[in-house]
Amino acid sequence: MMCLECASAAAGGAEEEEADAERRRRRRGAQRGAGGSGCCGARGAGGAGVSAAGDEVQTLSGSVRRAPTGPPGTPGTPGCAATAKGPGAQQPKPASLGRGRGAAAAILSLGNVLNYLDRYTVAGVLLDIQQHFGVKARGAGLLQSVFICSFMVAAPIFGYLGDRFNRKVILSCGIFFWSAVTFSSSFIPQQYFWLLVLSRGLVGIGEASYSTIAPTIIGDLFTKNTRTLMLSVFYFAIPLGSGLGYITGSSVKQAAGDWHWALRVSPVLGMITGTLILILVPATKRGHADQLGDQLKARTSWLRDMKALIRNRSYVFSSLATSAVSFATGALGMWIPLYLHRAQVVQKTAETCNSPPCGAKDSLIFGAITCFTGFLGVVTGAGATRWCRLKTQRADPLVCAVGMLGSAIFICLIFVAAKSSIVGAYICIFVGETLLFSNWAITADILMYVVIPTRRATAVALQSFTSHLLGDAGSPYLIGFISDLIRQSTKDSPLWEFLSLGYALMLCPFVVVLGGMFFLATALFFVSDRARAEQQVNQLAMPPASVKV
């Protein structure tokens, strides 16, 4: 369930959008006659969100340096560019990282850590929840699937609301909501399993509000250089929170002697974070899409945006690839700890688990690996793409494809190694996850390149929906179902418990290979789709009469 909604959401801060907004402001300034007096006026002193096209355009996977030719914009309006256009035009420098905005970004990133911590705490104590509520195998998959389905459905809705209402209020309400629901769920009586299922669904809705809106606030708080840094920190919250969730779940349960307490940690931190968001996060005006003007907004309906996205082959293929990543991470996150425990039973290095929790130690190790490989993957992917861009324009999708195909090999090797060596299996998990997670940041860049600014919010929401629908919404359930089907046709033994789950999990590398193929398909169309997007951006910068969408 290491989903990409956060990574994709950050795509809203793309270079083309920056340049596009800049051109429009210059154009408006020129139409007014002379100065840039109106260029940031509408945004006021909070205009940190107005971006810089110059100095250095940085993406998560590299940067392109441009020579600054003049002084920065007016001090009171950071990032405000001069209005002249042309070779000698003044280029703004990115706003310095103000203490208030830095604190705001830190709080938003902390909130994202808690989002994932909460989600994975349940995974960490899932066996205890099953034991307490008498949950059968089919009920265990239901818990995670309900969460992801509600998250998936709610994300586009909050994306829509986030463009129209006060975002920090929605954000805080979302955190307060999931915190209250999670806390309450730790008191659900044994006979009300359906209430636990409902609570996971409600938590999914609450967390969706955060994942779709928080990155857009970060996007409006910073200009390009610092924005990329802040969004990178926001991405890192995903593996960090996920890993900490596993660890928190297992550790708190052991310390308190009762799994119920594991569900009470993240809500307390969530309430604090929600309050800090209300206090410390400034009520930023919406960013660059708002600068397009009413005329353009009136011309692009949601339906037209959807049609355009579906015709965008790079976007479609990269979204399908994202779904493959989501499928694999969802299934592996749910089942690998139990699989490794069963491997140890077969190797006779662990007892058959007759009284759960089973695989608690494996959950802890897997959590730590997930945490570290998330960091390593993003850094490796970004570095590889930066280097490959010197060789080819198709670097982004090609690096993703290589990462996916390499990951599939190591995921396959997990099942080979687990039969004889748990350490070997963990090494394969480490390499496989690093390669799998290497495309997080790059996927966001791909979306930035091939989707025009006015469609990015819709693109992010649709990609999030698709990756969950085809990915982690059903994969844990599907793996459990396949494992059960295999076991029903075999004799009861620890060996077949181990083998059946292993055979079911073998679906993951096949799906990952499919994802790699989708990235290769993306590479075929990437250059032309990117050029088309840039062309459309340039058209948007022309006088309104000539705008075509």
Epitope: H132, F133, K136, A137, G139, Q190, F193, Q488
Partner: antibody, heavy 125, light 107 residues
Framework: EVQLVETGGGLVRPGSSLKLSCATS????????MSWVRQAPGKGLEWVAL??????????NYAESIKGRFTISRDDSKSRVYLQMNTLRDQDTATYYC????????????????WGQGVMVTVSS | DIVLTQSPPTLSVTPGESVSLSCRAS??????IHWYQQRSNESPRLLIK???QSIAGIPSRFSGSGSGTDFILSINRVESEDFSVYYC?????????FGPGTKLEVK
């Protein structure tokens, strides 16, 4: 109508083995969790062992007093649950009841909604 | 393990009287308590589940209450067939445990 019928009891010497069987009918056995509960003469009830459905790995749980000596198992094709009792002790003398846990498709209750008539096991030298 | 204590061990009542049987847990167990009746030379039968939920086929004079550590089984106007032993059982955590029982006898 739900029915649970225990067989296999009798008089055995300490240290010997005995296998109890419980034949069931009137419900979907393969989906249902089953337990054995015992009652020493003139004493209270004591839960012995539980076995979950096959899709839950036929996972078994045991009371501490019998762990390592007793094994619960099931045969879904015959709708039967078994209790293999090894290294029997005097204090294992009791009436053994086969019990059913109420089933709710996605989860199961840990309480016993149906009980067999019981089978007497006497361990004596 | 969670220990259940039932009181009183024996309760003498006359038919038509109403009685309350107590069950106390050694730690908080929410509402994960169940009540069984065992008549002489018979198997136990489930009376109440989850502290207060009634069971089909069980007379309405039997009711349960309580949460946390203290639970009550109430019998409204005891009838002759009610004179038997009553056990409480907890399902909050494994191992599943029973109380020692309360014997309801004729006064």
């Amino acid at each position: 109508e739900v029915q649970l019928v225990e067989t296999g009891g009798g008089l055995v010497r300490p240290g010997s083995s005995l296998k109890l069987s419980c034949a069931t009918s009137g419900f979907t056995f393969s989906d249902t969790w089953m337990s054995w509960v015992r009652q020493a003469p003139g004493k209270g009830l004591e839960w012995v062992a539980l076995i979950k459905d096959k899709n839950s790995n036929s996972e078994a749980n045991y009371a501490e007093s019998i762990k390592g000596r007793f094994t619960i198992s099931r045969d879904d094709s015959k709708s039967r649950v078994y209790l293999q009792m090894n290294t029997l002790r005097d204090q294992d003398t009791a009436t053994y009841y086969c019990t059913r846990h109420e089933d709710f498709y996605y989860y199961s209750g840990y309480y016993f909604d149906y009980w067999g008539q019981g089978v007497m096991v006497t361990v004596s030298s | 393990d969670i220990v259940l204590t039932q009181s009183p061990p024996t309760l003498s009542v006359t038919p038509g009287e109403s009685v309350s049987l107590s069950c106390r847990a050694s730690q908080g167990i929410s509402t994960s308590i169940h009540w069984y009746q065992q008549r002489s030379n018979e198997s136990p039968r489930l009376l109440i589940k989850y502290a207060s939920q009634s069971i089909a086929g069980i007379p309405s004079r039997f009711s349960g209450s309580g949460s946390g550590t203290d639970f009550i089984l109430s019998i409204n106007r005891v009838e002759s067939e009610d004179f038997s032993v009553y056990y409480c059982q907890q399902t909050y955590s494994l191992p599943l445990t029973f109380g020692p029982g309360t014997k309801l006898e004729v006064k």
